[in-house]
Amino acid sequence: EAHKSEIAHRYNDLGEQHFKGLVLIAFSQYLQKCSYDEHAKLVQEVTDFAKTCVADESAANCDKSLHTLFGDKLCAIPNLRENYGELADCCTKQEPERNECFLQHKDDNPSLPPFERPEAEAMCTSFKENPTTFMGHYLHEVARRHPYFYAPELLYYAEQYNEILTQCCAEADKESCLTPKLDGVKEKALVSSVRQRMKCSSMQKFGERAFKAWAVARLSQTFPNADFAEITKLATDLTKVNKECCHGDLLECADDRAELAKYMCENQATISSKLQTCCDKPLLKKAHCLSEVEHDTMPADLPAIAADFVEDQEVCKNYAEAKDVFLGTFLYEYSRRHPDYSVSLLLRLAKKYEATLEKCCAEANPPACYGTVLAEFQPLVEEPKNLVKTNCDLYEKLGEYGFQNAILVRYTQKAPQVSTPTLVEAARNLGRVGTKCCTLPEDQRLPCVEDYLSAILNRVCLLHEKTPVSEHVTKCCSGSLVERRPCFSALTVDETYVPKEFKAETFTFHSDICTLPEKEKQIKKQTALAELVKHKPKATAEQLKTVMDDFAQFLDTCCKAADKDTCFSTEGPNLVTRCKDALA
């Protein structure tokens, strides 16, 4: 239904708190360098304007689109060109081109310092003084670093943050209460960010059809008792919600997500028996809970997939009649039978099935041709299963840090031209898959591992797009999203790479490393490891282990020494010499 004033409609639907939070996120994701105070001022102006429109929908400018209203606000910021360069050119365009232009200027890797958490006492003081401003800062800092973060989910994480602070700031030992809880929220939020970025990439590069296929597979796994029409409706709605969020239409996105949650809770009987606990929660928690609800129990009497998709005489006729519907039905039927497969794998199987029908239905005797299609799925299924087994075995043997190092070596050999910080970030993230997935029950490992790796590799591709340096990476990133992970896995040592010359300063360390937090120490060591591989791409695992053990021993010794500086300056050069010899 059309509303006279879009902004009044969204303000009424969302309520002031969520409205303000979403507008702040939107501005922070578009203009990532502006301070919190600059954005907070704009948010207040937009909110005051929205209230005038609620009071009188016919008031001046209330009939303007949200893009026009928000774009005009952003373009009125002083010194836009000085701070944002060519992004200011967007302001010369009309809607919808202006918004598209803003979207294209979103930076996935903004040059902002890491978000440092203040110490507990200071955090609690500022939280108690002004909880609204405190949470505003949180939304601003996360949104500007993650310009595609799923906005309604970010409101959920802010709510979690709020609850943790409310609880822990009342404790005597605030630090030990806050740290593990906030670390947990941070880890979940970072995973949420890369997953959502993958969805937006899917939408941007391959369109709504690709995203909808992803949604059909995912929803069919989760709700195997829902019929195809129900799954299609949910997938269509979910696609709309994600399209809006990826497109910067955050108010519409949050509003439609709330509607979808409401619909699911009102139609539990035809969707799933597992929704009630989620549906009892307040809005943000409800929508979050629904997004990760456990799989419903699979119907016991499902016929073999072959009946309708291989043995049925009408396969090619059904395919001819309505390709997308027939392939969608195949994806639905296959996915609801396989909660143990990754969505990426299910989409690869659907793609293989489609290619088989395209080829076979054109032949003189199609059934003889497509009769073996299910058998041809076997290698596609075995490949990720082997990946999971091999990597989880390695993780169990080495632990998270050792596993990250193994991945770092592997990926540096595959793409040595990629910058060391990007390789280290990617390897650390890819290595977390062990902790995240390898501890799960057998039937949950594959979906967890492959879909998480796909999301991390999507970030690698986005960063590489900005400065393409490796043909290997370009090749894997150019194909379809579901083929990326197998493509990266299949890469071997890049034979075209000319090894980096050995620079002693790259491996020279100072006593300040001793006081770094453990995570930062690990990053320093991993940076050195990547540089070693770039120097000797064909070094054996044994050679690299020798060097890294020596390095760890050196750090341990010097950091325990009475005169750390002297130890580093005398033992450092000896370490460098031993490294060169070990790799010779």
Epitope: E314, K317, A320, E363
Partner: nanobody
Amino acid sequence: QVQLQESGGGLVQPGGSLRLSCEASGFTFSRFGMTWVRQAPGKGVEWVSGISSLGDSTLYADSVKGRFTISRDNAKNTLYLQMNSLKPEDTAVYYCTIGGSLNPGGQGTQVTVSS
């Protein structure tokens, strides 16, 4: 909606000829292999002949090999079956189907071979 309309049947003496046509609509005809099947009174459906989407590959049941010729005109969305040297045992309702299906979709066209 997929539609297949067969025509060209009739009564013919043994040794005579007929040319059946099948007009297709509702799908991309040029991308699908097509088939002729037949059903004699009181019998099951029998596969007669198949042709690939481009018309570059054809197959025939042993019982009609050398007598029947399947062809297609993708520009006209039409499938043909040229039947020569007809025999009484060729008497049946003939149907065209998509992609090797043995499930008759259209009305079919009656072919009767009798002296």
